[in-house]
């Protein structure tokens, strides 16, 4: 557990007036319907609110927007909906923020059946001020920004036609026809599907992937029989149909599609899916479906190319296509994750993994917890996490689990105690140390959000009444103070605070409701006269995260190097500031045999650090595809964990050798790919 | 120990609407838990009608689907049943009934003592 | 929807005899997802079995249950007279529907 100093909760002092004089009011002139808020940047304080109400009429449905502008943070609010001509704007699309601190927004206006095409409301101000732009076509999804560039914009129309522009949306060019799925990658490279036949559902499995680098001047197909693609960090996947039946493949590139190699994972059928849990440029985590309706399937973790897969993890519940897993990258500490299985017993049971999937273990039991009515053994349980699937089947879990990668090794989330996840109502939990040791921190569900990075961490009661206490910690949720932020209680709809954990601002969101009418309105509380001076370098602690055994002189050693980070003190009550860059001080480990992957061909017995061969490949040539050739593989089973900095120790022994012969099973091979240019 | 007591009215008209309450004692709904009804027609087996979780999520049978409503009432620690346009074939001792504790599961370990209701003009 | 259809009817056997009860399943169901029920005339029906096999709070031993799959089965060892009773199994699988099997009548010979 990380230090917590002062077990002893000292009250914050005078901490009602001085939130009462950071407490701002705001409530809006509007019917109740459905609000949406977006941050505008980083650190600028710039809000936009559309708030809209749908009045079903016998005929049509008539709809009304307004439009709302805030710069400090939601203390104050501006209408500025004639700056869009007092349009209705389409919720479905949302507002389109630019990356990065662009200020660039893009709103999507409804119109009338019998328009030519759509109308975009453009500002690159931060909203101050708003273009109208008549489009050329209906947009199908929101606009997407080129992450490289914010003036370039693409658009699936409902026509499947791939829009594009190159000057945020001014002037518009349809590059292609008969589209499907559209992404951006790297340097302003777009990545589409199209159909020949009749439609995206009437050729799936018979797609064409292609490729445009200069926004639709020149086109490559690098792949025929997709069934569907993705991008995951340098990873580019896609799903391929097998020659003569009705499985697919995984098949990756990590060259946008020049080269491919065929995946060492299992294929799929028909009603089977595979889904990219997590990536990054180190390594993927790939969810394959289990054949049947069973809501699981199995994860695997890849090597450094995302071509060999280990097996990671059996069981993980994934209900169905699109549908829910729990799988949860905890972000405040390096190598962590959270996710769900489902056991033998059908029962769901939440795993961790510290080392980037190379073992899962259950959650320790909270001290301050008793194990519930799932308990066969009312001394021996374990904490189960609500995530995704909880929230699905519409338990009373008001929030997934919480985690910010500047307030170091935090997690908060809602969970029971037991042997499995239980349809009890939750309690929530936190854990200071990455997940290793959890402590109830409140009793029943609560909305509950970071501030200040860690400094500050603020919970509301989820109730089916009106609300009007707020609670806050400012050590970690050990303590917790109460403040009445209104006389009069509102209907709470949610928590927001600005991207990134680094503001001291909190926006309450709700509704009132009188005889007549009912309004938004919302609180913000700033925290800054709580936490009244800057934190020194007395008010931090040198904490060594993973840190199991400190007798061990490879303690803390995760992926071949152990980090300390400077973290605040429990009883420190200082602000971080907006500018608070985590400390951190890795140095490497030796290596050891936690520091390799089995190999293809190669597996883990359980509670075993060596890898041995799978029974059925013993005696056979390791032999699989690599862009479109054979490779021999010479290993004694082991691989370097993706984004492990190990040295020294323990050096298993690995040849590839190119055996020259082209693979008959890779289906994206460089003979099947042409270009062409517009 | 948590106890289930149905009640309602015995006798329902056809085309009306049948209703019926099991307030629960000993465990307060709102802890969680699914809640559910069963029915049982005179000498034959067990048919699950739905279930209710304590927020209001609820779960039924296809086959009734369309004339079921279960809701829950936290404040009484109640939940309820509405069955419309009955007929005949929904004469049947009614059972209400807690769920197990684990999500995902939904055989019944604590039961009502039932309550017969008729169908008849 | 998954059918259940538990046999025989109705089994004559004698006190301190062992009993055992079929329940098939129209298709597969987990095992974990099967459970059975005593009712004796007049009363609400009792957990006896959940998860094909586990034994509910304060079951007597003599009851188990097996199978998986398509076929699952209820033993009763050695029949005491207050086990004469009828007995169902239910499936709950992921999905509602949730089933139950028409019944087996376990009386005195």
């Known amino acids: 557990s990380a230090p917590g100093e002062d077990e002893e909760c000292g009250r914050v002092r005078d901490f009602v007036a001085k939130l009462a004089n950071n407490t701002h009011q705001h409530v809006f002139d509007d019917l109740r319907g459905s609000v949406s808020l977006s941050w505008v940047g980083d650190s600028t304080g710039v809000i936009l609110v559309l708030t809209t109400f749908h009045v079903p009429l016998v005929i049509m449905t008539f709809g009304q927007s307004k439009l709302y502008r805030s710069e400090d943070y939601g203390k104050n609010f501006k209408d500025i909906t004639d700056l869009i001509n007092n349009t209705f704007i389409r919720t479905e699309f949302g507002m389109a923020i630019g990356p990065e601190n662009s200020g660039k927004v893009v709103l999507t206006a409804e119109v009338s059946g019998g328009s030519r095409g759509g109308r975009i409301f453009r500002s690159s101000d931060f909203a101050k001020n708003f273009v109208q732009t008549d489009l050329p076509f209906h947009p199908l999804t929101q606009m997407m920004y080129s992450p490289q560039n914010s003036d370039y914009l693409l658009a699936l129309s409902t026509e499947n036609g791939l829009w594009v522009s190159k000057n945020f949306g001014g002037k518009w060019e349809e590059i292609h026809k008969a589209v499907c799925l559209a992404k951006w990658g790297s340097d302003n490279t777009i990545f589409f599907t199209t159909y020949a036949n009749g439609s995206c559902k009437a050729d799936l499995g018979a797609l064409e992937l292609w490729r445009t680098s200069d926004l639709g001047k020149s086109f490559k197909t690098i792949g025929v029989k997709i069934y569907s693609f993705g991008l995951g960090g340098r990873f580019l996947f896609a799903s391929v149909m097998a020659d003569k039946d009705t499985t697919r493949r995984i098949h990756v590139s990590t060259d946008q599609g020049d080269t491919w190699s065929m995946a060492q994972l299992p294929s799929v059928g028909q009603e089977q899916f595979y889904s990219i849990l997590a990536a990054n440029d180190d390594m993927v985590f790939m969810h394959v479906d289990e054949p049947g309706d069973t809501g699981f399937g199995t994860i695997f973790t890849s090597d450094d190319r995302g071509i060999v897969y280990s097996k990671s993890l059996d069981r993980h519940l994934y209900t169905t296509t699109g549908g829910e897993t729990d799988f949860t990258n905890v972000t405040s500490l390096r190598g962590v994750y959270i996710t769900s299985v489902l056991s033998e017993d059908n029962s769901i049971q939440t795993m961790i993994t510290f080392d980037q999937g190379g073992r899962w273990t259950h959650l320790r039991k909270p001290e301050n917890s008793e194990c519930d009515a799932t308990a066969k053994n009312k001394n021996e349980c374990s904490l189960h996490i609500h995530a995704s699937y909880s929230i699905s089947q519409k338990l009373n879990v008001p929030m997934a689990p919480l985690s910010e990668p500047n307030a170091v090794g935090i997690v908060i989330a809602h969970g029971s105690v037991g042997d499995a996840i239980s349809v009890m109502v939750p309690d929530v939990y936190i854990s200071d140390d990455g997940g290793y040791s959890w402590t109830k921190m409140l009793e029943g569900p609560h909305y509950y959000t970071i501030l200040d990075s860690g400094g500050i961490i603020v919970a509301i009661e989820h109730s089916s009444r009106p609300i009007n206490v707020i609670k806050f910690s400012t050590d970690e949720g050990q303590c917790w103070q109460t403040y009445t932020f209104t006389r009069d209680p509102i209907y709470f709809t949610g928590l927001a605070s600005e991207p990134g954990a680094r503001s001291m601002n909190i926006s309450i969101w709700g509704f009132t409701e009188s005889f007549l009418t009912s309004q938004w309105v919302s609180y913000t509380i700033d925290f800054k006269d709580i936490l009244e001076r800057n934190c020194e370098e007395k008010d931090y602690t040198i904490w060594l995260a993973h840190s199991t055994d400190p007798e061990d002189y490879e303690d803390g050693c995760i992926l071949g190097y152990k980090e300390q980070f400077l973290r605040l003190r429990k009883s420190s009550v200082c602000q971080n500031g907006r500018d608070y860059v985590v400390t951190k001080q890795p140095s490497i480990c030796l290596c050891s045999l936690e520091d390799f992957l089995c190999d293809f061909g190669y597996y883990r017995p359980e509670n075993d650090s060596k890898c041995v061969e799978q029974p059925e490949l013993k005696g056979h040539d390791l032999e699989f595809c690599l862009y479109g050739r054979e490779e021999h593989l010479t290993t004694n089973g082991y691989r370097k964990i993706p984004g492990d900095k190990c040295q020294g120790g323990v050096n298993p022994v690995r040849e590839v050798k190119d055996l020259k012969k082209k693979c008959t099973s890779n289906f994206l091979s460089p003979e099947k790919q042409n270009s062409k240019s517009n | 120990q948590v106890q289930l007591q149905e009640s309602g009215p015995g006798l329902v008209k056809p085309s009306e609407t049948l209703s019926l309450t099991c307030a629960v004692s000993?465990?307060?709904?709102?802890?969680?838990?699914?809640w559910g009804w069963i029915r049982q027609p005179p000498g034959k087996g067990l048919e699950w009608i739905g279930s209710i979780y304590h927020s209001g999520n609820t779960y039924y049978n296809p086959s009734l689907k369309s004339r079921v409503t279960i809701s829950v009432d936290t404040s009484k620690n109640q939940f309820s049943l509405k069955l419309s346009s009955v007929t005949a074939a929904d004469t049947a001792v009614y059972y209400c009934?807690?769920?197990?504790?684990?999500?995902?599961?939904?055989?019944?370990?604590?039961w009502g003592q039932g309550t017969l209701v008729t169908v008849s003009s | 929807e998954i059918v259940l259809t538990q046999s025989p009817g109705t089994l004559s056997l004698s006190p301190g005899e062992r009993a055992t009860l079929s329940c098939r399943a129209s298709q597969s169901v987990s095992s974990s997802y099967l459970a059975w029920y005593q009712q004796k005339p007049g009363q609400a029906p009792r957990l006896l079995i959940y998860g094909a096999s586990s034994r509910a709070t304060g079951i007597p031993d003599r009851f188990s249950g097996s199978g998986s799959g398509t076929d699952f089965t209820l033993t009763i060892s050695r029949l005491e007279p207050e086990d004469f009773a009828v007995y169902y199994c239910?499936?709950?699988?992921?999905?509602?529907?949730?089933?139950f099997g028409g019944g087996t009548k376990v009386e005195i010979k």
């Open positions: 000993g465990y307060s709904i709102s802890s969680g838990y699914y």
């Open positions: 009934a807690r769920g197990p504790p684990e999500l995902g599961k939904m055989y019944f370990q604590h």
């Open positions: 239910q499936q709950h699988g992921r999905l509602p529907p949730w089933t």
